[in-house]
Interface confidence: low
């Protein structure tokens, strides 16, 4: 990769809210249709997980099109405001420990563990295999390590110092990486390839964090996740440089990354991804 357009950027983790689609049309690309009108409409962007503006041509298109931002939000996002509960004593835990269990929209029925903020314990639940949220762990031990309090009210292990805990919080699929490294690129680079909800067969690339390489996969045309690139080069640019050597806790992490606004073409949408 050419490095001439890179700069040093301070990396901070950003967390996407849980995504649960009540309708899979929320995963459709924004479709302006064949007509030539200029009408301001809103669509749900599955990658940014937000309702965004687009220009509609006035005819055809698809159902992921709303007259107002409010209508879009009502149809395609769930109100998470009362799902995330934080108290002063709980600040040590990552925010996602306070999310409700979320099986996602698929039907894989995989046994996983989540932190139940009511019982203050990690409990078993059935995960569908896609989407959902980060309160989702492969083992009871990992869940306890990250979200449960120790006997004196503090964390059993500090989130952020345990590599596997970090990885598992980023991807429910629990992609392990060599223990001398931490991943501080976009969290979606750690997610597994996800074909999505539709029936197309488009050639795409995803970043395989186990082997540290971009690999091809077949994309269905809608849904899926952000680990989805139209070229191997785009995939490498977005994800390859995220691995850095571990440093002592508390230090600012600096690593070479792309410019502040890196244009990444993901699935149908072109979105601007702020460096994480």
């Amino acid at each position: 990769d050419s490095e001439e357009d890179e700069e040093h950027t301070i990396i901070t983790d950003t967390e996407l809210p849980p995504l649960k689609l009540m309708h899979s049309f929320c995963a459709f690309k924004a479709d302006d249709g064949p007509c030539k009108a200029i009408m301001k409409r809103f669509f749900f962007n599955i990658f940014t997980r937000q309702c965004e503006e687009f220009i509609y041509g006035g005819c055809e298109g698809n159902q992921n099109r709303f007259e107002s931002l409010e209508e879009c939000k009502k149809m395609c996002t769930r109100d998470n405001a009362n799902r995330i509960i934080k108290t002063t004593l709980q600040q040590e835990k990552p925010d996602f420990c306070f999310l409700e269990e979320d099986p996602g929209i698929c039907r894989g029925y995989i046994t996983r563990y989540f932190y139940n903020n009511q019982t203050k314990q990690c409990e078993r639940f059935k995960y569908g295999g896609c989407l959902g949220n980060m309160n989702n762990f492969e083992t009871l031990e990992e869940c306890k390590n990250i979200c449960e309090d120790g006997p004196n009210g503090f964390q059993v292990d500090n989130y952020g110092t345990q590599l596997n805990a970090v990885n598992n919080s980023l991807t429910p699929q629990s992609t392990k990486v060599p223990s001398l490294f931490e991943f501080h690129g976009p969290s979606w680079c750690l997610t597994p390839a996800d074909r999505g909800l539709c029936r197309a067969n488009e050639n795409r690339f995803y970043y395989n964090s186990v082997i540290g390489k971009c690999r091809p996969f077949k994309y269905s045309g809608c849904g899926g996740n952000e680990n989805n690139f139209t070229s191997k080069q785009e995939c490498l640019r977005a994800c390859k440089k995220g691995f850095i050597q571990r440093i002592s806790k508390g230090g600012l992490i600096k690593t070479k990354r792309k410019r502040k606004k890196q244009r990444v073409k993901i699935a149908y949408e072109e979105i601007f991804v702020k460096n994480m």
């Epitope: 689609l21 009540m22 309708h23 899979s24 049309f25 459709f28 055809e60 298109g61 698809n62 159902q63 209508e71 009502k74 149809m75 769930r78 109100d79 929209i105 698929c106 039907r107 909800l197 539709c198 029936r199 197309a200 045309g221 809608c222």
Partner: antibody, heavy 119, light 107 residues
């Protein structure tokens, strides 16, 4: 076992109103959207409206917007359809159907309730 | 609105025959098509969704295929209990619309 049971059909005068109900059981009510679909005697199926039980967000067939109101009561696991200004052509069997977001299709249907609009 | 056209209102068949019921959309519906079966006096039953995925419990003699505007439901070996009305439906955009139905009857 998923069950959807409609009620509230019957004979209505033209210009009148009626409220159909659908009692859902056998699954978590807020996990799936619910729809109303109607079928005129000897005719095909016609989608009327859809509701997301979690936030009450609705989708309507524009043909019925203004005359039809879909609603739900999560505490009662019930779906409703209020139809106003009824006409003879509204005579149909009205079905309540569970809309499965993964499939984007209606995977369970009630037995239907017949609405007859006649003077 | 998207119009779903089932060109054959009736199709005659015999037990053991292979039969294909077609459905044409007035615009590309991107495989967002479901097929339903309705027997006399009964409510519709979901057979196929996303054009080709069989719903739970549906016998494997039922298959769906298609893309763009053209979709087909095929019954590989018709059984007596398959005699019914078959509807296609697009769920690409609202209003969700159904085809007029194809009635499968015995020769």
């Amino acid at each position: 076992e998923v069950q959807l049971v409609e009620s509230g059909g019957g004979l209505v005068q033209p210009g009148g109103s009626l409220r159909l109900s659908c009692a859902a059981s056998g699954y978590t009510f807020t996990d799936y959207n619910l729809d109303w679909v109607r079928q005129a005697p000897g005719k095909g199926l016609e989608w009327v409206a859809d509701i997301n039980p979690i936030n009450g967000a609705t989708l309507y067939n524009q043909k019925f917007k203004g005359r039809a109101t879909i609603s739900r009561d999560n505490a009662k696991n019930s779906l409703y359809l209020q139809m106003n200004s009824l006409r003879a052509e509204d005579t149909a069997v009205y079905y309540c159907a569970r809309y499965y977001g993964d499939y984007d299709a209606m995977d369970y249907w009630g037995q239907g309730t017949l609405v007859t609009v006649s003077s | 609105d998207i119009v779903m056209t089932q060109s054959h209102k009736f199709m005659s068949t015999s037990v053991g025959d292979r039969v294909s019921i077609t459905c044409k959309a007035s615009q590309d519906v991107h495989t967002a098509v479901a097929w339903y079966q309705q027997k006399p006096g009964q409510s519709p039953r979901l057979l196929i969704y996303w054009a080709s995925t069989r719903h739970t419990g549906v016998p494997d003699r039922f298959t769906g295929c298609g893309s763009g505007t053209d979709y087909t439901l095929t019954i590989s070996s018709v059984q007596a209990e398959d005699l019914a009305l078959y509807y296609c439906q697009q769920h690409y955009t609202t209003p969700y619309t159904f085809g007029g139905g194809t009635k499968l009857e015995m020769k």
